[in-house]
């Protein structure tokens, strides 16, 4: 799978994680920090 950094316009899209662009899937994806979930890593779980 080809991966690159998201465009600058997506800075701040992932609240608690890193935005990566999955080239083959044409999708932005939030790689969440430990303890966070959700499309934008917006939910905290214990």
């Amino acid at each position: 799978v080809s991966i690159t950094k998201c465009n600058s316009d997506m800075n701040g899209y992932c609240l608690h994680g890193q935005c990566i662009y999955l080239v083959d899937m044409s999708q932005n994806y939030c790689r969440c920090e430990v303890g966070y979930t959700g499309v934008r890593c917006e939910h905290f779980y214990l």
Epitope: N7, D9, G12, Y13, L15, S26, V39, R40, E42
Partner: antibody, heavy 116, light 106 residues
């Protein structure tokens, strides 16, 4: 399936304001950014601004700053674009556009006519 | 703001011709460019995103290339149904459309 349904055509007098709505279904606007783009008759496409409904953060094109207000109501899954101090040059089709995880998905457009 | 300079603004070509449209960004947009087709009275239709990724259902005669600040959109063999206006869009930093290219048949 995912949809963006915009409000109907409007006719406004010069100097008035217009508020166009964009209701999302099939997805949560909090997972996206909502952009607004307009196109005057016979002219090109022009990006106006966008909102991040989750953070309630807006960014506007400089030329519209102070005249456009983009808002979102996450309880009804609806975004809004209000343009004030209307002039004849604002006659255009206004589109809302979803961006975020996937690339852009457009609403059907709303024609706003400014005429006295 | 990033500026997008699209050229030519209009062109006339014969059916079967190769058609090329260029967009130049005022700074590096890291391949974050899309190409739209718009026919009169219709909303824009996305053809290509991320420089060269063709959307599902878009004919393979459409292609895109480029990097840095210079990008190209190509129709390898112009068809009558390709008569439209084409726009580039940079989405690296916010969004900026090119001025459009009206494609007509000779």
């Amino acid at each position: 399936q995912d949809q963006l349904v915009q409000s109907g055509a409007e006719v406004k007098n010069p100097g008035a304001s217009v508020k166009v709505s964009c209701k999302a279904s099939g997805f949560n606007i909090k997972d996206t950014y909502i952009q607004w783009v307009r196109q005057a008759p016979g002219q090109g496409l022009e990006w106006m601004g966008r909102i991040d409904p989750l953070r309630r953060q807006t960014k506007y094109r400089e030329k519209f700053e102070g005249r456009v207000t983009i808002t979102a109501d996450t309880s009804t899954n609806t975004a809004y674009m209000e343009l004030s101090s209307l002039r004849s040059e604002d006659t255009a089709v206004y589109y809302c556009v979803r961006s975020g995880r996937e690339f852009d998905f457009w609403g059907q457009g709303t024609l706003v006519t400014v005429s006295s | 703001d990033i500026q997008m300079t699209q050229s030519p603004s209009s062109l006339s070509a014969s059916v079967g011709d190769r058609v090329t449209i260029t967009c130049r960004a005022s700074q590096d947009i890291h391949k974050y460019i899309a190409w739209y087709q718009q026919k009169p009275g219709q909303a824009p239709r996305l053809l290509i995103q991320y420089t060269s990724t063709l959307q599902p259902g878009v004919p393979s005669r459409f292609s895109g290339s480029g990097s840095g600040t210079d990008y190209t959109f190509t129709i390898s063999s112009l068809q009558p149904e390709d008569i439209a206006t084409y726009y580039c869009l940079q989405y690296e930093q916010l969004r900026t459309f090119g001025g459009g290219t009206k494609v007509e048949i000779k």
